[in-house]
Amino acid sequence: NFMYSKTVKRLSKLREYQQYHPSLTCVMEGKDIEDWSCCPTPWTSFQSSCYFISTGMQSWTKSQKNCSVMGADLVVINTREEQDFIIQNLKRNSSYFLGLSDPGGRRHWQWVDQTPYNENVTFWHSGEPNNLDERCAIINFRSSEEWGWNDIHCHVPQKSICKMKKIYI
């Protein structure tokens, strides 16, 4: 009976996500067979989050809307380890929008999920950000510095990275 009710709960939870994510990839968390964490297929997972590299080129606002439709946001990078994971899936000759912007042009950078902007955990390329007109952040590769962040005009289409919390069933 217990197993039956657990299965029913899982199925109803899966149905919630089905319209956006028809297929989930799930792994068992820890030793308890009861707990599974899932990411939409073909998203990648790191710690408690799922990531999707969107190769369509869109403006920052359209990229964020695109992530939002999938139940995600443009990526918020909280640690060096997280960035190191993300860059494994990026192409060196491309740029990708982050969920970081300065809409007022006053260098008050803000993350889309309201995570406080911490100057000590940022990975700007040297000399960046450098232009008050450029109010959105990308991550890109520079041969001298490897991967880092740069400020660019928000309306210029780029690829993007979406991030969502893992689905626990």
Epitope: S59, T61, N131, D133, H153, H155, V156, P157
Partner: antibody, heavy 121, light 111 residues
């Protein structure tokens, strides 16, 4: 008073080249993103190119990408548009304009009087 | 590309009467409460002049008989009381995503 003065237009044969200039005064030119917009005779407006204040980022529509190059010399307060492989459909009045951000978008707030480019054999 | 479609192509209005110009975007140009549509006025032989930005914000120095409204995909420029000096072509433009695109223009004349 902001002034933008375009020059360099003229008659050129198809396949030829032309370099337009836009001399700016009354603004701190080096802090402005700048754009070129064109208008074919009797037609509407078409965005042609944008360059950021430092000159390290440039943007173009597909219609001119690979043929036109926007550049700037902040020491001379001057914006340029190098136009190569010109076609009859590039015939237009070319305006330079200052770019002002508006949250995630922008406006073109000051415009020059324009310079005429005619591509014809 | 985002297509901006203006209507009507031309408009004849009596002096002192209201003129209304419509602009439809092929997709939403809104984000976070702002609409990225601008309106420009172009008089014969002159460059365009910015009138309205962000769909409804009046540019400094522009008479307040001009107003803009709308959101999403549908936008309107209104001249509440047409003056002789308002004879011009009016263009909408979106700045949400490159390439920036303009409407085809609406010619406003006096009836």
């Amino acid at each position: 008073e902001v002034q933008l003065l375009e020059s360099g237009g003229g008659l050129v044969q198809p396949g030829g080249s032309l370099r337009l200039s836009c001399a700016a005064s009354g603004i701190t030119f080096s802090t402005y993103t700048m754009s070129w917009v064109r208008q074919a005779p009797g037609k509407g407006l078409e965005w042609v190119a944008t360059i950021n204040s430092g000159g390290d980022n440039t943007y173009y529509p597909d219609s001119v990408k690979g043929r036109f190059t926007i550049s700037r010399d902040n020491s001379k307060n001057t914006l340029y548009l190098q136009m190569n492989s010109l076609r009859a459909e590039d015939t237009a009045v070319y305006y330079c304009a200052t770019y002002r951000p508006y949250y995630y978008g922008s406006v073109l707030d000051y415009w020059g009087q324009g310079t005429t480019v005619t591509v014809s054999s | 590309d985002i297509v901006m479609t203006q209507s009507p192509d031309s408009l004849a209005v009596s002096l002192g009467e209201r003129a209304t110009i419509n602009c439809k975007a092929s997709q939403s140009v809104d984000y976070d409460g702002n609409s990225y549509v601008n309106w420009y006025q172009q008089k014969p032989g002159q460059p365009p002049k910015l009138l309205i930005y962000g769909a409804s914000n009046l540019e400094s120095g522009v008479p307040d008989r001009f107003s803009g409204s709308g959101s999403g995909t549908d936008f309107t420029l209104t001249i509440s009381s047409l003056q002789a000096e308002d004879v011009a072509v009016y263009y909408c433009q979106q700045s949400d995503e490159d390439p920036w695109t303009f409407g085809g223009g609406t010619k406003v004349e006096i009836k």
